[in-house]
């Protein structure tokens, strides 16, 4: 996260931390005791889940090895399109005033609204500080219009972008596949932005997972 | 700002190992976010691209070479190497350490453009 | 592996002309195309990124266009500096990395 501060403790409990052994690999959400969300671009063979801990390395929180992960259908490694993926944990997750599950949106959020994105990536680029606390930015709903012109074709139908006016304030790497919450709800996964992060009026882009919420739970049904 | 530098023998011998490192300055390869990579160039043909390694140690190969290649990083030294096994006359080339600048972060770091060159040295395969 | 194809491989142009290279890719790759630019005995320089991205201290008669499978680099008015072999690079996430055949570009 670039230009942001240290997340209110306990402000996230429906955030996890996606390792590669003991290496941040992306951000994600518990949907339930037995799923995650995450960006499909996070994909790997096996997944160990950082759960109710603002503190990577905290012994005190939970981890779960995950092996079974399922990208959406129509992810495109070339566009992004579709950039979402459920992944499975191999036991459930023990629910608790830090480990809650995260409210799914029932509608879209509009142009304007402030959000939170938070995640254990980066805090500078191009060279790299990685925080052992989750941090946090408040950043805004921009309309797919704006967002057009700074991206051109690169944006799609189901891409959602945040940012502030003349400000650094962005996800960087590390972030991925972590929340964007807008009014208390899911309204983003951190999908991709421009290099170096931080670039003023450069928008970050996010997965708009409003328009997912069927995918998510008939996928979850499916593979119960 | 930053520099690439290569070194290694400028002759090796058919069947013996290539071996040539590449010196970064003016900036660190352990902590910065980019990839660094090695491309040859054939006398008078084009470019082909070795392999990469990520900053965090992950490296990525051509699969035409994979068989015979290894890129390493030493942070102590702020050096990248490449070894390159059974060399034969067709491994004859200007050999080139570049940096690789990452297109974008997320989904769009894994594509990058190679921004800074060094200036390349001459390996002959030849007994 | 994605094949990258340069036309022309060589072309003679004046000082002032306006000088177009094509590169096709085999498939899809969306934006995500390097332009490159050599001269005789010298490392390649970064021109153009992600398609259509001038890279910091090139002059802007460089541009590029493109995204999907068929990419343009265009030299609004060529400067003697100019005169040198371009090459168009294909960013992985999946290697290898590849480049065209590059494109000679020679005083008439």
């Known amino acids: 996260i670039i230009d942001g501060a240290p997340c209110a403790r306990g402000s996230h409990p429906w955030q996890v931390a996606l390792l590669s052994g003991n290496q941040l690999h992306c951000g994600g959400v518990l949907v339930n005791e037995r799923w995650v969300l995450t960006a499909a671009h996070c994909k790997m063979n096996e997944y160990t889940v950082h759960l109710g801990s603002d503190t990577l390395g905290d012994r005190r929180a939970q981890r779960i090895k995950a092996s079974k992960s399922f990208r959406h259908p129509g992810y495109s490694t070339q566009t992004h399109v579709n950039d979402l993926m459920l992944v499975k944990l191999n036991s459930q997750a023990r629910l608790s005033s830090m480990v809650k599950k995260v409210r799914l949106p029932s509608r879209c959020e509009p142009p304007g609204t402030t959000c939170t994105v938070s995640g254990w990536g980066t805090t500078t680029s191009p060279d790299v500080t990685f925080p052992s606390d989750l941090m946090c930015v408040d950043v805004k709903l921009i309309s797919p219009q704006d967002c057009t012109k700074v991206y051109k074709d690169l944006l799609e139908n189901s891409m959602l972008c945040a940012g502030i006016p003349d400000s650094k304030k962005n996800a960087c790497n590390g972030d991925s596949g972590g929340p964007l919450v807008c009014r208390g709800t899911l309204q983003g996964l951190v999908s991709w932005g421009t290099f170096p992060c931080g670039q003023p009026n450069d928008p970050g882009v996010y997965t708009q997972v409003c328009k997912f919420t069927k995918w998510i739970n008939d996928t979850m049904k499916k593979h119960r | 700002q930053l520099q690439l530098q290569e070194s290694g023998p400028g002759l090796v011998k058919p069947s013996e190992t290539l071996s040539l490192t590449c010196t970064v300055s003016g900036g660190s390869i352990s902590s910065s976010d980019y990839y660094w990579g090695w491309i040859r160039q054939p006398p008078g043909k084009g470019l082909e691209w070795i392999g990469s390694i990520y900053y965090s140690g992950s490296t990525y190969y051509n699969p035409s070479l994979k068989s015979r290649v290894t890129i390493s990083v030493d942070t102590s030294k702020n050096q990248f190497s490449l070894k390159l096994s059974s060399v034969t006359a067709a491994d004859t080339a200007v050999y080139y350490c570049?940096?690789?600048?990452?297109?974008?972060?997320?989904?769009?770091?894994?594509?990058?453009?190679?921004?800074?060159w060094g200036q390349g040295t001459t390996v002959t395969v030849s007994s | 592996d994605i094949q990258m194809t340069q036309s022309p491989s060589s072309l003679s142009a004046s000082v002032g002309d306006r000088v177009t290279i094509t590169c096709r890719a085999s498939q899809s790759i969306s934006s995500y195309l390097n332009w490159y630019q050599q001269k005789p005995g010298k490392a390649p320089k970064l021109l153009i990124y992600?398609?259509?991205s001038l890279q910091s201290g090139v002059p802007s008669r460089f541009s590029g266009s493109g995204s999907g499978t068929d990419f343009t680099l265009t030299i609004s008015s060529l400067q003697p500096e100019d005169f040198a072999t371009y090459y168009c690079?294909?960013?992985?996430?999946?290697?290898?990395?590849?480049f065209g055949g590059g494109t000679k570009v020679e005083i008439k």
């Open positions: 992600s398609a259509s």
């Open positions: 570049a940096r690789g600048r990452p297109l974008g972060y997320g989904a769009r770091h894994y594509y990058y453009g190679m921004d800074v």
């Open positions: 690079q294909q960013s992985p996430p999946f290697p290898p990395l590849t």
